[in-house]
Structures are given as C-alpha cells and as structure tokens.
Interface confidence: medium
C-alpha cells in the first residue's frame, strides 16, 4: 500500500474579516493510526490551532466527523476571522507513539489571507482658526484594513485636491494596516459653507468608498469690514452715527464705541443677519448729543472679532456748524482708519 500523503488542495484561501475560513485537508490512507493536528506557521515557534486528540478550540469545528473509523477528511472551519488570523496553516498527521505521538507527515500548507474593511475615515482640522488666503492642514486617518492596497482622495466641495501626502503603515508586512494623510487647503472668504472630504477606496468596500468630512466653518475666521456713517439729524441736538460690521465669521464679536478716545458703550453682536455665503452682518448705532460737545468729536467704532486684536474705524463729527444743519449742508467727514487694510471710506452727506 502507498505511503500516506497529507493533501491540502488549496494553496491559498481569502476570507473577509468576521467570516468563517474553511481549511481543507485529506489523507490518502488510514495507516498509520494517529491523530491529526493543525498548526499556523512552521518550525519550533508554530502555533497549535486544533488537536484532534485533546484540547479545547472554541473557534474551530471539523467539517466531517473525525470519530468515524474510516474518516480521511480532516478539514476544519475557523469562525469569526480577524486580520490576526492571517498566515500559513499546516495539516499535520501524527503516528501513535509511546509516550508521545510522533509527527509523521505534513501537508504543503494553505495561506490564509484576510480581507478587512478600513474604519470610517476621521478627518481633523487645525486647532486654531485661520483667515482667508492662508493654507491650513487637514489630516485623515483610517485603520484596520487588509490587504495593504488602498486609495485615498481629498476633495473640497467636490473638487479633487492634489496637495496632500499619504502614508500607509506599517511599511512592512502586517496583519492589518493604517492610512494617514495630510492635505493642504487654501481658505477663501466663501469657505464658511465649504466641506473637506477624505475618501477611502479599498477592495473590501466593493466600489462604495468610505468618506470622512470636516466643515471649514470650524476652521475659518473671516474678519469683518467696517463702515461708519452719519445719519440725518433725528432731533434738534442729536446725531445718529452707525457702524456697519460686514462679512464676518464666526459670530463672536464685541463692539465698542469711543468718543474722543473714551469708551462710550460696549455691546455684543446678537441680532445678526446671515449672508448667502454664511458670513454675518451687524449694525450698531450711537446717538450723539452734539450740544454736550464744544469741539469736533472723533467717534471710533472698535471691533474685537473672535478674540483677535481689535480693528477700528473713525468718523469726525463737526460740531462747529449749527446742529440743525448736520446731515443737510455741513460736510461730516468719515476719516476711516481700519487697521486690517479695508478700504478707506470718505462719505459726505449733503
């Protein structure tokens, strides 16, 4: 009779994480008598996966009934596969011996490869807000996938970005991998409603990529433009001066009125109006009692936006003319000085 051979017909088996792997093994003879064992790896450091004779292997089930005398099928199923189960599995026939069984013959081995899905990409932006024209970095991370091949793309509002760097770790062989990518995005004033998207495509996703997003509203700061104007006279000795605070984001804003450098009033932006681009407008007004002033009055609208250094705009109120004429035929000059280099406005009301 021909000597027993251990046949492992599958050179490799590919299984998705969470599924059951079937590792096939048959013997060509019933002789010699002795148990079968399954190992992962070869050599002295090999790991016992299943022992027909003894032991408890909760994840392993046999395909056929190994207790039957004429059984020659030693295939096993391993449940709930994870990337850590990847490796080469050997079906090994032992010969009955005393005191210990002796290894008789091994199969050629079956390489188990595990396909594992990447985790949902997590996109994170910079810790501090930045203003338009500045470049900010976003990172995207996804973990636990196998095999290593993966594609990552960045988008801003549907437009693919090209300025990014991606690493898949570890660089060597591993049971599973992680991807880390950093993209550079240039902010514009219109980006309050914009989104940055990281898209990950992997063989396990069957053409349906995973996406992670970050809203630029959490990253951008749009500084306000200021305009101070004098309104027509409302009463005999009163002049109404308004400060228009336009196109700012986020809403956190504090406005202070100064008369000749002295604080007159401080208020916080509350009833703002929202622009289509997501920025806000706000208007504050100051009623100035002209009769209380002998000389011209320098009115300053000072705005502190989102904890940044204050920007201001000034307006010179001429009180030398008869108050009734304010807003009719006396030139009230707006000598704007906006430190953020916004346009100088010189308004003359007739």
């Amino acid at each position: 009779e021909e000597e027993l051979q251990v046949i492992q017909p599958d050179k490799s088996v590919l299984v998705a994480a969470g599924e059951t792997a079937t590792l096939r093994c048959t013997a060509t003879s019933l002789i010699p008598v002795g148990p079968i064992q399954w190992f992962r790896g070869a050599g002295p450091g090999r790991e016992l996966i299943y022992n027909q004779k003894e032991g408890h292997f909760p994840r392993v089930t046999t395909v056929s009934d190994l207790t039957k005398r004429n059984n020659m099928d030693f295939s096993i199923r391993i449940g709930n596969i994870t990337p850590a189960d990847a490796g080469t599995y050997y079906c090994v026939k032992f010969r009955k011996g005393s005191p210990d069984d002796v290894e008789f013959k091994s199969g050629a081995g079956t390489e188990l490869s595990v396909r594992a899905k990447p985790s949902a990409p997590v996109v994170s932006g910079p810790a501090a807000r930045a203003t338009p024209q500045h470049t900010v970095s976003f990172t995207c991370e996804s973990h636990g996938f196998s095999p290593r091949d993966i594609t990552l793309k960045w988008f801003k509002n549907g437009n693919e970005l090209s300025d990014f760097q991606t690493n898949v770790d570890p660089v060597g062989e591993s049971v599973s991998y992680s991807i880390h990518s950093t993209a550079k995005v240039v902010l514009t004033r219109e980006d309050v409603h914009s989104q940055v998207i990281c898209e990950v495509a992997h063989v396990t996703l069957q053409g349906d990529p995973l996406r992670g997003t970050a809203n630029l509203s959490e990253t951008i700061r749009v500084p306000p433009t200021l305009e101070v104007t004098q309104q027509p006279v409302r009463a005999e000795n009163q002049v109404n001066v308004t400060c228009q605070v336009r196109k700012f984001y986020p809403q956190r804003l504090q406005l202070t009125w100064l008369e000749n450098g002295n604080v007159s009033r401080t208020e916080t932006a509350s009833t703002v109006t929202e622009n289509k681009d997501g920025t806000y407008n706000w208007m504050s007004w100051l009623l100035v009692n002209v009769s209380a002033h002998r000389d011209d009055v320098k009115l300053t609208c000072q705005v502190e936006h989102d904890g940044q250094p204050a920007v201001s705009k000034s307006h010179d109120l001429k009180v030398s003319a008869h108050p009734k004429e304010q807003g009719s035929n006396t030139a009230a000059e707006n000598t704007g000085s906006n430190e953020r280099h916004h346009h100088h406005h010189h308004h003359h009301h007739h």
């Epitope: 690493n167 770790d169 570890p170 660089v171 060597g172 062989e173 591993s174 880390h180």
Partner: antibody
Framework: QVQLVQSGAEVKKPGASVKVSCKAS????????MHWVRQVPGQGLEWMGW????????KYSQKFQGRVTITRDTSATTAYMELSSLRSEDTAVYYC????????????WGKGTTVTVSS | DIQVTQSPSSLSASVGDRVTITCRAS??????LNWYQQKPGKAPKLLIH???SLQAGVPSRFSGSGSGTDFSLTINSLQPEDFATYYC?????????FGGGTKVEIK
C-alpha cells in the same frame, strides 16, 4: 558572502550633482530593498530613501524629495543614488544598506562613500 | 512623521558593567524597532531587529525589549569591543527615522 561595494569618494562644487553606486553580491538582489542613509560628520544617521529592487518601487524622505533620485540595474545588481543641487551641508558619508521586506531593518551595509561639497 | 528620542546621549561605563539605553517613539510603532552599533569610521552594524530579535552572529550579551512606544537595549557585562555609538531606528512608518545616538565611553 553578502557584500555591498560602494563607489569611491567624490569632491563636488556647490550646485553640482553626485551619483553614488552600490554593487550587491552574495544574495538575490531582487529579493530585498536597498536603503540610502547619510551621516554628516559628527552627527547621526539620516534615512534618505529606498528602492525595492524587485519592482523598483521607490520611497524618498520628504527632506530630499526633488533632489534625490534612487535607481537600480538588476542585471548589474547595482543600486544608485543621485543627489542634485549640492550644498556644503550635503558633505557627508553616504551609505547603502540592504533592507528586509518585513521589518525594514538594514542588515548589511556598504562601507560608505564620502562626498565633499566645497567651492 | 515619527520622532525617535534616544537617551542618554552619552554614558561612561566600565568593562563588566550592565548598560541600558532607551528609545522612545512619538507614536506607537508595535515592535518595528531596530538597534545598530557604529564604531568611528565604520558603517553601522545591525544588532537587534523587531525590538527583541538578536541578529545572527551578535553576542548574546546584547538584548532588546519593548513594544509600542518604549524600547530598550541592554548590554550585559560590557566588553572592550562594545565601546561605540548605538542607534535605534523605527521602521514602522516612512520616513524611517533614527534616534540621535548614544555614545558608550570607557569610564
């Protein structure tokens, strides 16, 4: 035995390029990566990049990206490292080292090639 | 990029001493850490790969341990030929990076 033999010392002027070769013998050239590492006098080791000799996949350190080119000739079992736009701070010993494909350790090193950049 | 911090930068020891050098990675690198020895004017020599696996031909007085972010190289019973500079290197992520080195000098 496994050996990496590097080309001889070079003296270059700032702005020039240098190409260092590394001839491998004693093993299957295409079964390993080849790393390039440099050491500025009195300083530590700095990884520049690698080439996987089998499929010519290349990875460069961002620091040298655009200035370094790593190539290989499988028939000559030789790897090459070319560094362009040389400056005085590129004066260093340049090593090639055989790399493992799993842990990416460098188990065999060349003796090093001294490159001096001076006007 | 992963930074690898080695300490101490230098140490003085006597023949027969037990010496430990540590290496810390800025993020978890599993066991993707290797140790090298370099003598003046010579190329580095691999001592230990995969955090704790002794390279063939390296004396057993050298041993490595650690996983994740903290690693160490120990030389049991320092020999005259062990006075050199030692470098750790992470091979988890590109760019591959080396520690700054530890110079072991004779006391």
């Amino acid at each position: 035995q496994v050996q990496l033999v590097q080309s001889g010392a070079e003296v270059k002027k700032p702005g020039a390029s240098v190409k260092v070769s590394c001839k491998a013998s004693g093993y299957t050239f295409t079964s390993n990566a080849m790393h390039w590492v440099r050491q500025v006098p009195g300083q530590g080791l700095e990884w520049m990049g690698w080439i996987k000799a089998g499929n010519a996949e290349i990875k460069y350190s961002q620091k040298f990206q655009g200035r370094v080119t790593i190539t290989r000739d499988t028939s000559a079992t030789t790897a090459y490292m070319e560094l362009s736009s040389l400056r005085s701070e590129d004066t260093a010993v340049y090593y090639c080292a055989r790399g493992d494909y799993y842990y990416y350790y460098m188990d065999v090193w060349g003796k090093g090639t001294t490159v001096t950049v001076s006007s | 990029d992963i930074q690898v911090t080695q300490s101490p930068s230098s140490l003085s020891a006597s023949v027969g001493d037990r010496v430990t050098i540590t290496c810390r990675a800025s993020q978890s690198i599993s066991d993707f850490l290797n140790w090298y020895q370099q003598k003046p004017g010579k190329a580095p020599k691999l001592l230990i790969h995969a955090a704790s696996s002794l390279q063939a031909g390296v004396p057993s007085r050298f041993s490595g341990s650690g996983s994740g972010t903290d690693f160490s190289l120990t030389i049991n019973s320092l020999q005259p030929e062990d006075f050199a500079t030692y470098y750790c290197q992470q091979s988890y992520s590109t760019p591959l990076s080396f520690g700054g080195g530890t110079k072991v000098e004779i006391k």
